[in-house]
């Protein structure tokens, strides 16, 4: 059977006026997954995102991540899109005060 990913979006200061947003998917099986940043619901070009390999996380499941840089104040325009085993979800960037955003998908 399949195990849905836990999706976690974080943000960190990049340079003045910009922030780096990172979307991590973990504890999923099988390893095939789509994880990408969308701007206004449209996927960013591959060369404007940084990608992590899909790696085993030690429990027979897998983990990966994707990151991009955005303008501070434009967080609402960006979502992390995840597709796994026929299910999909979108995950917003947390507001400045909150640095973690966890979702488990079934």
């Amino acid at each position: 059977g399949s195990v849905p990913p836990m999706v976690n979006v974080t943000r960190s200061e990049a340079s003045e006026g910009n922030i780096t947003v990172t979307c991590r998917a973990s504890s999923f099986y099988p390893r095939n997954i789509t994880l990408t940043w969308r701007q206004d619901g449209v996927s960013l070009s591959h060369d404007t995102q940084q990608w992590g390999d899909v790696l085993p996380d030690g429990n027979g499941t897998y983990q990966t991540w994707v990151a991009t840089r955005i303008c501070q104040g434009e967080e609402q325009r960006f979502t992390c899109y995840m597709e796994h085993s026929g299910n999909h979800s979108t995950h917003p960037v947390p507001s400045g005060n909150s640095h973690h955003h966890h979702h488990h998908h079934h």
Partner: antibody
Framework: EIQLQQSGPELVKPGASVKVSCTAS????????IYWVKQSHGKSLEWIGY????????ISNQKFTGRATLTVDKSSSTAYLHLNSLTSEDSAVYYC???????????WGAGTTVTVSS | DILMTQTPLSLPVSLGDQASISCRSS???????????LEWYLQKPGQSPKLLIY???NRFSGVPDRFSGSGSGTDFTLKISRVEAEDLGVYYC?????????FGSGTKVEIK
């Protein structure tokens, strides 16, 4: 086949409101945003805003803030554009559109003509 | 708001001619992460617009290879290598790098 079916033409009085619908078919509705675009007669195109059907989140052109409300009904795969306090300036064709993987308006509805007249 | 200025407003052509439309943005539309959301649309009378080019230079599915897009920063160009009758209509450039998204005023390609 991916389609966006829009509601029919509307003739409304100044000061009234109107609700234009856009029903999606041929794909999973919550996978893609729905955009709304205005085209006044013989004029260029104007972006109104968009809604993410998965989260219900919206981003709008400030020019339309307070006058245009975007909503969705996931159960019927339908997006709505609600315009209030209409004036003759709002007489236009209103389009809904859907993005694709890397592009913004890959699929368009046929447009809904709204005429504001007393 | 970012102003998208298209030139010319009207472009009379003979079938088989090359046509070139310019679109200039009032500021750079390269986003912080390097993404440039610049698209071209063609609208024929009584029809919805149709997507031709996305992310500056990528042809949309089913668009003939006589259409090409180029440019960067603030200056963008759509070229039609050999105009055919089905290419007549109004062409719009569109930027979605910054909110509010904005369209150019349109270029009408018509028979000379």
């Amino acid at each position: 086949e991916i389609q966006l079916q829009q509601s029919g033409p509307e003739l409304v009085k100044p000061g009234a409101s109107v609700k234009v619908s856009c029903t999606a078919s041929g794909y999973a509705f919550t996978k893609y945003n729905i955009y709304w675009v205005k085209q006044s007669h013989g004029k260029s195109l104007e972006w109104i805003g968009y809604i993410d059907p998965y989260t219900g989140g919206t981003i709008s052109n400030q020019k339309f803030t307070g006058r245009a409300t975007l909503t969705v009904d996931k159960s019927s795969s339908t997006a709505y554009l609600h315009l209030n306090s209409l004036t003759s300036e709002d007489s236009a064709v209103y389009y809904c559109a859907r993005p694709g993987s890397y592009w913004y308006f890959g699929v368009w509805g046929a447009g809904t003509t709204v005429t504001v007249s007393s | 708001d970012i102003l998208m200025t298209q030139t010319p407003l009207s472009l009379p052509v003979s079938l088989g001619d090359q046509a070139s439309i310019s679109c200039r943005s009032s500021q750079s539309i390269v986003y912080t992460n390097g993404n440039t959301n610049l698209e071209w649309y063609l609208q024929k009378p009584g029809q919805s617009p149709k997507l031709l080019i996305y992310k500056v230079s990528n042809r949309f599915s089913g668009v003939p290879d006589r259409f090409s897009g180029s440019g960067s920063g603030t200056d963008f160009t759509l070229k039609i290598s050999r105009v055919e009758a089905e290419d007549l209509g109004v062409y719009y450039c569109f930027q979605a790098s910054y909110v509010p998204f904005t369209f150019g005023s349109g270029t009408k390609v018509e028979i000379k």
